[in-house]
Each structure stands twice: as structure tokens, then as C-alpha cells.
């Protein structure tokens, strides 16, 4: 039961995390205009990975996409790549984990297969989360660097008379969404990996003896096989019957249809 809960919770947490990563990637507020230096601005600038926007005090917002690939900073391209890799890995992980869920029965899938799939999805979620955290962190670092560079030459004199205020950018909401979402995906992945340990059936300690007419061999028949998960021994001992894939945990009544909720 604990395994099912851990696996289910891991799936849900990862699902929320990946949804957050997608949201963060699509959001326009990766960097927002720092209003500390000009709190009375009637024009507010903010930028995303895909476009930059200007919101006027009139309420009108104009967004322009970055319609070039070559002209964009390498760091921005790297952040885009990390976020996309995170989304793709996360999406594949979700797909894999759906079939690995203990509460869903698909044909006569063995526990070992489910354990492997759970581990695979868990690793994918961990990498996905790390990609998102890395992407957001790279962007944040880029912002901090640019912020202090623009602070250093905040005012550039025009003819020694007129002052032009340089627009500085600070952390936007998308960064915080990305960090939280990446963290959730990472946690969900760890939970899936932990659940995998409980899913993997142990080799049983008893032997099934078969007698033959020739009377010369004693066959050792394992009740199941132990999946190579890389983890230590299971905390919960599970007996398997007839060498089949069903454990005691599965001897509950299941709904007639697969429950994907």
C-alpha cells in the first residue's frame, strides 16, 4: 500500500512539476523591468524566452517575438534548450510512469517490468527537474550579471546635459515558477525511484523440489525474479506464487476498467 501511495504521489508531484515547467517556458515574465530606479514609469518592459513585451499605462500590451535564431545570445539558446529537454524528458517520463503505476493493470505486466518502468520514469523526472532548475539558474545568473553591468553605467550622459535612464531587468515570475516546478519534478522523480524499490519482487527463500523418475536432479525454482534496480534489498518482503507476477499487494479487488485518474 505504501509503495502504491509513494508511486502515485510521485506521479502527481511530477505531473504538477512538468506542468509548471511547461508554464514557465511559455511565460513572458522571465525578466521584468526593475522599477527601483524609475518607479514612475508609464511603460513597463518584460521579456520571456520567446518574445519581449511592453505594457503601457494605457493598458495596451505589445509583444514581439524573437524571429531570429542566429542573432540571439548563446545563453538564451542554451536556456531554451534546457527547458525543452526538461519538458520532453518529463513528458516521456509521464507516459512511462502511467503504465508503471501499480494501480493500473495492463495485461499481465510483471512487477519487474513495472519496477523498471518506475525507475526509468523516476530517473527521467530527476533529469527533467535538473534541466529546468539549470535552465532557470543560467537565466537568473545572466540577469544578475547584466543587472550589475547596467548599474555600473546606469546613467550615460548625452552631451553632458540630458540623462538617459538605462533599463535594468530583474527576476520575473517565470523564474520562480521554474525553480519550484523543477524542484517538484525532481522530488517526484526521487519518489518514483523509492517506489521502484518496493515494487521489485524479492527472490524467495524456499525451494520447490520436483521429483523425477530418474531421481537425480533437484530443481530450484524461484518464485519470481529480482529486478536489477541498483537498490538494496526490499524493505517489504513479498511472496510470489506460481512464479507469477502478482504479489500479495495485488490480491486486492481491482476496478474492471483501467483507472487512469
Amino acid at each position: 500500500m505504501a509503495v502504491t501511495a509513494c508511486q502515485g504521489l510521485g506521479f502527481v508531484v511530477s505531473l504538477i512539476g512538468i506542468a509548471g515547467i511547461i508554464a514557465a517556458t511559455c511565460m513572458d515574465q522571465w525578466s521584468t523591468q526593475d522599477l527601483y530606479n524609475n518607479p514612475v514609469t508609464a511603460v513597463f518592459n518584460y521579456q520571456g524566452l520567446w518574445r519581449s513585451c511592453v505594457r503601457e499605462s494605457s493598458g495596451f500590451t505589445e509583444c514581439r517575438g524573437y524571429f531570429t535564431l542566429l542573432g540571439l545570445p548563446a545563453m538564451l539558446q542554451a536556456v531554451r534548450a534546457l527547458m525543452i529537454v526538461g519538458i520532453v524528458l518529463g513528458a516521456i517520463g509521464l507516459l512511462v510512469s502511467i503504465f508503471a503505476l501499480k494501480c493500473i493493470r495492463i495485461g499481465s505486466m510483471e512487477d519487474s517490468a513495472k519496477a523498471n518502468m518506475t525507475l526509468t520514469s523516476g530517473i527521467m523526472f530527476i533529469v527533467s527537474g535538473l534541466c529546468a532548475i539549470a535552465g532557470v539558474s543560467v537565466f537568473a545568473n545572466m540577469l544578475v550579471t547584466n543587472f550589475w553591468m547596467s548599474t555600473a553605467n546606469m546613467y550615460t550622459g548625452m552631451g553632458g546635459m540630458v540623462q538617459t535612464v538605462q533599463t535594468r531587468y530583474t527576476f520575473g515570475a517565470a523564474l520562480f515558477v521554474g525553480w519550484v516546478a523543477g524542484g517538484l519534478t525532481l522530488i517526484g522523480g526521487v519518489m518514483m525511484c523509492i517506489a521502484c524499490r518496493g515494487l521489485a519482487p524479492e527472490e524467495t527463500n524456499y525451494k520447490a523440489v520436483s521429483y523425477h523418475a530418474s531421481g537425480h536432479s533437484v530443481a530450484y525454482k524461484p518464485g519470481g525474479f529480482k529486478a536489477s534496480t541498483g537498490f538494496g534489498s526490499n524493505t517489504k518482503n513479498k511472496k510470489t506464487y506460481d512464479g507469477g507476477a502478482h504479489t500479495e499487494d495485488e490480491l486486492q479487488s481491482y476496478p474492471s476498467k483501467h483507472d487512469y485518474v
Epitope: 508609464a42 519581449s52 511592453v54 499605462s57 494605457s58 535612464v165 538605462q166
Partner: antibody
Amino acid sequence: EVQLQESGPELVKPGASVKMSCKASGYTFTNYIIHWVKQKPGQGLEWIGYINPYTDGPKYNEKFKGRATLTSDKSSSTAYMEFSSLTSEDSAVYYCARLNRGNAMDYWGQGTSVTVSS
Amino acid sequence: DIVMTQSPSSLTVTAGEKVTMNCKSSQSLLNSGNQKNYLTWYQQKPGQPPKLLIYWASTRESGVPDRFTGSGSGTDFTLTISSVQAEDLAVYYCQNDYSFPFTFGSGTKLEIK
């Protein structure tokens, strides 16, 4: 057709208050911010502040803060400006204007003339 | 506050002439986010409210005759009337739309001979 209809002229005593209105028609009132501008006789234009009818959130020019109060009523599509502690310096024509793209005031009311005299 | 300085304060021209009036701001009105200058030009005829002519320094408001042209960037702006008509008799104001408080220039009074 977009129209901003302002209330009639006011003759008030020094120290008194005056409340003028600006009724909007021909567009969705909550979609545009309403600004107020002061013009003294034979002089230039001075920005007082604005009211966002959607949020009822005002913003004031520091010079008029505390004396000007901007409000709006969605049900009647009307913006209001109340001016308190009036002096002769407040004798002017007060315009309401709709803010559009580019932060430009594209439609203006005909103006409310306020005369402060004892 | 951004100070808007208009010059000249008044102009007297004959119909058909080309007219240029200037507006200078104490701070740049160029927004880096969209590379637009937040400067607006208004025309105020005697006894009337101001009328929007040009916004974003050079974008003509719909219905405004094409003889009116706005130009400039950063801190220096110009309003040009290519061929002045009798109905152009008015005071022309430039306005900072970039930061609060919105500030207006003192105006340029255009008179026709």
C-alpha cells in the same frame, strides 16, 4: 461614436470643494483609463492624475495629491474628480481624457470651467 | 519630473508655408523594450479641448491630415506641417508619455498671416 461628456461650469467659494463628472459613451468604459488635465486661462496643460475604471485604482500627480480625489462608477460609465480646499489658483478648465495606445489621450471632454471667487 | 521645453513659443506664417516646431525633453523618452519614443503632439484650437495629432513621436492618429509629421528620437523631437492651412491656427503641445507625472511643453502658438 466615442464621447466624454463633462459636467457644467462651477462657481465656488475659496476653501470649498467641487466635484465634477465625466460621462463616457461609445466604448467599453472599463477598457480605458481616464486622465484629468488642468488648464488655467491662457496657460498650458497640467496633468492631475488618472483613474482606472476597471480596478478603481487612481494615480496622482504629487502636486495634486491630497486635494484631488479620482473615482469612477462602472454602472453609469462615469468618472469623477473631487477637488478640495479650493483657492483662486484652482480657477481653470478641467478636462477628462481617454488614454489609448502609446499612452496618448485620444478623446477629450469639452472641459469643466471652475471659477473660485468669494 | 521630466521637463518639456518647446520652441519657438510662437510662429507667424503664411498659408502654404512649411512649419517646424521643436520639443526637447530633459530625459530620453525612448523605451528600449520596443524602441518607441513616448512623445505625443496635441493641437488645441481656441475655445476647444486639445486634439491628438501624433503619438509614439511619429505615428499619426487616424483622421489627422498627412501634412502633419512627427520626427525625432530620445530627447529631441520635431513637429512639421508641410503646407500650413488656415485651419491649423492653434497652440501645439508636446507631452511626455514615458513617465509619471505626464508633463506638457508650454506650447507653440501658430498664427497665420
